[in-house]
């Protein structure tokens, strides 16, 4: 039994261009929490295993928010050591996937959303007991420095915590009823030591007197990073007299990496570059499956059938991203209509919409008209929400309660007599002229400059009395016409009314629950 | 191999209290929401409570013939979830199932709760 | 909460024959159903979720679909281990509620 300890130095932009300023999104402050996973690296029963060694979650890290123009500092992390006891031997080779995971404290509806920002996943070597091994490395455009070990907890000892040890006091024996807790060591041994130099934080050793490197290093006491490497480039099995490599096949032909990995070549070997949900020499391990719990928000995790996933996330009514780990911001899409107020209840959207409008998406205008109808055959025209109206001839103001007088802006032209009437205005045209607003000069010889247009009319004219008639009857017509739609808008009111009052009822249950 | 195993039921008087436990294996417990689920006898199922995760602050929330007379907890370090029940009601005669998730997927084996005087 | 009704109650089939059962939702419930089969003395199974996926393991006789308020099962052709009770769930609006069941029984 033990305890692999990680402690995270350092996580933000990594250098070069296009990296992001901030972890947070536009939508406010947040802070970051950390995940680790571990699984044994070696066995093939690995490839669909859990975190079998264990997991582990951090705390959240302080709230961040960035200060604009402010040039991106370290981000707040989250304080402490990152834990994962181990029950059972230490492998000695191990998968590593640490996952930066992003909080965001603006205005969510139904608590914070979480988004994954970065996922490392790397193999290891390590034995426990040893030094803590640092690392760098990169996700995206995301940069995570960290250290970690592994510890073995007493009465275990050893590189794999597998032998057990006591101090010399202790009896010899293991108790009554017990059974022989071999291999019992007959005092607590101190680690190996290593060669002489051997460098505490790139090399380890299981046997006195060896230097073993961490991936990534090389050398007798492990002290050459293995991309300076004066041979950088070069192919082909190693020059026994230069210890340089020599030209020969590349190690990446007929690409290695499984899974649709990309390979690289380095000194003497090749390196795969894994697509998600893979990782291993040669991406053949899945690193991510569905007893890992990877979906956020309860999401049902599902085995990828295409194979650059290694699974998917169902998710949940109002999550959404690979993980479920975004909240879906529903009402960004404004779906309610008429200045309708969205109400993301988690499950479903509701609409709680502004008077005079009705319907799941306040898509149905009740204009007001049917409670505020237009006096005086006044007509009432939909739209915007608020009601208005279009009078009849002599009435004017919201609702067509004010008497207009039309003659005011003096309508007839050439000295023609302005006469009010309920219908509109009727103009008396002086001599030599004619037309609705005397607009038309009569020639000398009585015929009009425009013979088409029909005469003004002047008091006692015969055919005065036939044009009132007509516009009476017409009048007479629109009145009912308008008395017709004041009563089916009343009748279609009262049905959207009861059914906001019903919507309104379940959205209070609903908000209360 | 994952697995969900209940265990805790047995016959109890009405107003009795009794105490279910679901030890899980196979999975990052951890990371899964768990809930309990009730089947009557000879009748269909029924959602009795779910509890979220640390990051969710153990989140908990139960059904209202429930409410106030069941606890949902869990034991990450041990992976294993409780279900307190309390003010047993002949009507809590079922057989209890835990499950995982929102959308029940890993579903264990069941342990029978006889609320009887 | 929202009610699923099933029917038919019983379903009375031989082996080898096209089973079809039916999930009712009193509101809309979007595609947010899921089918479970459990067999006497037997956990429940997820089957179907999202009205349509087979899960994981699933046998492609099982199919589901529908929307809203309607949702259909359909056991293309059954087979001895298919003789259960199938429930339907909505998972659309919180809690989750889960229909009376069908006896899909050998004839």
């Known amino acids: 039994a033990g305890v692999f300890e990680l402690q995270i130095h350092s996580f933000g932009p990594g250098p070069g261009p296009g990296a992001p300023r901030s972890p947070c999104s536009a939508r406010g402050p947040c802070r970051l929490f950390f995940r680790v996973c571990l699984k044994p690296g070696l066995s093939e029963e690995a490839a669909e295993s859990p975190c079998a060694l264990g997991a582990a979650l951090s705390a959240r890290g302080p709230v961040y928010t960035e200060q604009p123009e402010a040039p991106a500092p370290d981000l707040p992390l989250p304080n402490g050591l990152l834990q994962v006891p181990f029950r059972d031997a230490w492998p000695g080779t191990f998968s590593l996937i640490i996952e930066t995971w992003r909080e965001e404290l603006g205005d969510q509806i139904g608590g914070p959303a979480w988004s994954l920002l970065a996922r490392v996943t790397r193999r290891r070597r390590l034995a426990a007991g040893g030094p803590w091994a640092r690392d760098i490395q990169r996700a995206g455009a995301w940069e995570l420095r960290f250290s970690y070990r592994a510890r073995c907890e007493l009465p275990a000892v050893g590189t794999a915590c597998t032998r057990l040890c006591r101090p010399r006091s202790a009896p010899s024996r293991c108790g009554p009823g017990l059974r022989p807790c071999a291999p019992l060591e007959d005092e607590c041994e101190a680690p190996p030591v290593c060669r002489a130099g051997c460098s505490l934080e790139h090399g380890f050793c299981e046997q006195p007197g060896e230097c073993r490197c961490l991936e990534g290093w090389t050398g007798p006491l492990c002290m050459v990073p293995v991309s300076t490497s004066s041979c950088l480039g070069l192919r082909g099995p190693s020059s026994t007299t230069t210890g340089c490599l020599v030209p020969g096949p590349g190690p990446c032909d007929g690409n290695p990496c499984a899974n649709g990995g990309s390979c690289s070549e380095t000194p003497g070997s090749f390196e795969c570059t894994c697509p998600r949900g893979f990782y291993g020499l040669r991406c053949e391990v899945s690193g991510v499956t569905c007893a890992d719990g990877p979906c956020f928000n309860g999401g049902l995790c599902v085995g990828g059938a295409d194979p650059d996933s290694a699974y998917i996330c169902h998710c949940p009514p109002g999550f959404q991203g690979s993980n479920c780990e975004k909240r879906v911001d529903r009402c960004s899409l404004q779906p309610c209509r008429n200045g309708g107020l969205c109400l993301d209840l988690g499950h479903a959207l509701r609409c709680r919409c502004r008077a005079g409008f009705a319907g799941p998406r306040c898509e149905h205008d009740l204009d007001d008209c049917a409670g505020r109808a237009c006096a005086n055959g006044g007509t009432c025209v939909e739209g915007g929400g608020a009601h208005r109206c279009s009078c009849a001839l002599g009435f004017g103001g919201r609702n067509c309660r004010e008497r207009a007088d039309p003659c005011a802006a003096r309508p007839c032209a050439h000295g023609g007599r302005c006469y009010a009437h309920f219908s509109g205005l009727v103009c008396a045209c002086a001599p030599g002229y004619m037309g609705a607003r005397c607009e038309f000069p009569v020639h000398p010889d009585g015929v009009s400059a425009l013979p088409a247009a029909p005469p003004g009319l002047r008091p006692g004219d015969p055919q005065r009395a036939g044009v009132i008639a007509v516009i009476v009857v017409v009048v007479i017509a629109i009145v009912a016409g308008i008395v017709v739609l004041v009563i089916s808008r009343k009748k279609r009111m009262a049905k959207y009314e009861k059914a906001e009052i019903k919507e309104m009822g379940e959205m209070h249950r609903e908000l209360n629950a | 191999e994952v697995q969900l195993v209940e265990s805790g039921g047995g016959l109890v008087k009405p107003g009795g209290s009794l105490r279910l436990s679901c030890a899980a294996s196979g999975i990052t417990f951890s990371n899964f929401w768990m809930n309990w689920v009730r089947q009557a006898p000879g009748k269909g199922l029924e959602w009795v409570g779910q509890i979220r995760l640390k990051s969710d602050d153990y989140a908990t929330h139960y059904a209202e013939s429930v409410k106030g007379r069941f606890t949902i907890s869990r034991e990450d370090s041990k992976n294993t979830v409780y279900l307190q029940m309390n003010s047993l009601k002949t009507e809590d005669t079922a057989v209890y199932y835990c499950?995982?998730?929102?959308?029940?997927?890993?579903w264990g084996q069941g342990t029978t709760v006889t609320v009887s005087s | 909460n929202i009610v699923l009704t099933q029917s038919p109650a019983t379903l009375s089939l031989s082996p080898g024959e096209r089973a079809t059962l039916s999930c009712k939702a009193s509101e809309n419930v979007g595609t947010y159903v899921s089918w479970f089969q459990q067999k006497p003395g037997q956990s429940p199974r997820l089957l179907i979720y999202g009205a349509s996926n087979r899960y994981t393991g699933i046998p492609a006789r099982f199919s589901g679909s529908g929307s809203g308020t309607d949702f259909t099962l359909t056991i293309s052709s059954l087979e001895p281990e298919d003789f259960a009770v199938y429930y339907c769930?909505?998972?659309?609006?919180?809690?989750?509620?889960f229909g009376g069941g069908t006896k899909v029984e050998i004839k």
């Open positions: 499950t995982t998730g929102y959308y029940f997927d890993y």
């Open positions: 769930g909505q998972f659309y609006s919180f809690p989750s509620t």
